[in-house]
């Protein structure tokens, strides 16, 4: 697994460099994350041929995965910091049950899958402080998601994989835009 | 391999409207991370960013210019469209699409065009 | 608007020097920073991203360093072939900008 954020070399190397901002912490957590995903997107890719497979393809999955759309106020057009940053949150509360899927779907990557589980549990706390309205934040259901995830696991082995591939480059998809919008922070 | 190729008119009086269309291959538009920005370059002076099109439609605008430009896109087609308004001669430059492509969203500029002068 | 600062203007070098050329961002731009090399009449081209990180195709003379607001391109044994004008990049906010770039000649 990669070393997590503030321990990497650069920062052995500079020991007087000023302690990162808020905003530089999230965004590092969020590049952290990441190449925990691309790592194992790699091995994704190389068990299954699900990466060729076309975006008409997939689309026809019903995962109920988040997705950033403009409503969000994460946009430049429309852009509203407090509502972009609770669909932020939300958003990664909802992928929890997905990352948590994953834990069993990797062989060599097991611990990175953990990594990226843990740091992203992280980066929810990083966002929670942040923002100003936690009402406004709806918890998914405990009970809802624990019988997504039997029904996940159920899955044949071809589906699986599919789920798999989804919940990665969707949840790439979703950091994505969530660093975008965060610079604007 | 990756290419990009500018078109438009070489030639706009003052005040009409710029229209330049960028067509890429190699690529998709629609793939997380990738982004096409316009840039141009008068005549024997620097670079200066235009405006940037997200792969899933946000974009971004330089503010000294945001009142009179517009990008868009067309997936279906590999195009990425510019339009500027009311030109003036100061205009006159070479203009260039790139691409940028990383996990990160760093903007490092990968792939460029060839550019096309507009006067 | 973050403004890049290059320095110097023009450097005027004989084949087999080592040179740096230096980019000063006027505030903090981490990691976000790149190099394009742009020879006459051909378009840009990026040369070192992020800082350090080199790009393929490119030789392994041109390598780049610095953190926070201070950046150096460096070339280890300039080649007639690296004339140009080189240019760095804020990739940290909005609107991206370019330093007004750095001429490289011959003697």
């Known amino acids: 697994a990669p070393v997590p954020p503030g321990e990497d070399s650069k920062d052995v190397a500079a020991p007087h460099r000023q302690p990162l901002t808020s905003s530089e912490r999230i965004d590092k957590q969020i590049r952290y994350i990441l190449d925990g995903i691309s790592a194992l997107r790699k091995e994704t890719c190389n068990k299954s041929n699900m990466c060729e497979s076309s975006k008409e393809a997939l689309a026809e999955n019903n995962l109920n995965l988040p997705k950033m759309a403009e409503k969000d106020g994460c946009f430049q057009s429309g852009f509203n910091e407090e509502t972009c940053l609770v669909k932020i949150i939300t958003g990664l509360l909802e992928f929890e049950v997905y990352l948590e899927y994953l834990q069993n779907r990797f062989e060599s990557s097991e611990e990175q899958a953990r990594a990226v589980q843990m740091s992203t549990k992280v980066l929810i706390q990083f966002l929670q402080k942040k923002a100003k309205n936690l009402d406004a934040i709806t918890t998914p259901d405990p009970t809802t998601n624990a019988s997504l995830l039997t029904k996940l696991q159920a899955q044949n082995q071809w589906l699986q994989d599919m789920t798999t591939h989804l919940i990665l480059r969707s949840f790439k998809e979703f950091l994505q835009s969530s660093l975008r919008a965060l610079r604007q922070m | 391999q990756v290419t990009l190729k500018e078109s438009g008119p070489a030639l706009v009086k003052p005040t009409q409207t710029l229209t330049l269309t960028c067509t890429f291959s190699?690529?998709?538009?629609?793939?997380?991370?990738?982004?096409v920005s316009w840039i141009r370059q008068p005549p024997g002076k620097a670079l200066e960013w235009l405006a940037l099109i997200y792969w899933d439609d946000d974009k971004r605008y330089n503010p000294s210019l945001r009142s009179r430009l517009t990008i868009t896109k067309d997936t279906s087609k590999n195009q990425v469209v510019l339009t500027m308004t009311n030109m003036d001669p100061v205009d006159t430059a070479t203009y260039y699409c790139?691409?940028?492509?990383?996990?990160?969203?760093?903007?490092?500029?990968?792939?460029w065009g060839q550019g096309t002068l507009v006067t | 608007d973050i403004v890049m600062t290059q320095s110097p203007a023009t450097l005027s070098v004989t084949p087999g020097d080592r040179v740096s050329l230096s980019c000063r961002a006027s505030q903090s731009i981490s990691d976000y920073l790149h190099w394009y090399q742009q020879k006459s009449h051909e378009s840009p081209r990026l040369l070192i991203k992020s800082v350090s990180q080199s790009i393929s195709g490119i030789p392994s003379r041109f390598s780049g360093s610095g953190s926070g607001s201070d950046f150096t391109l460096s070339i280890n044994s300039v080649e007639p072939e690296d004339v140009g004008v080189y240019y760095c990049q804020n990739g940290h906010s909005f609107p991206l900008t370019f330093g007004a770039g750095t001429k490289l000649e011959l003697k």
């Open positions: 190699g690529f998709s538009l629609t793939t997380s991370g990738m982004c």
């Open positions: 790139a691409r940028s492509y990383d996990d990160y969203l760093y903007y490092a500029l990968d792939y």
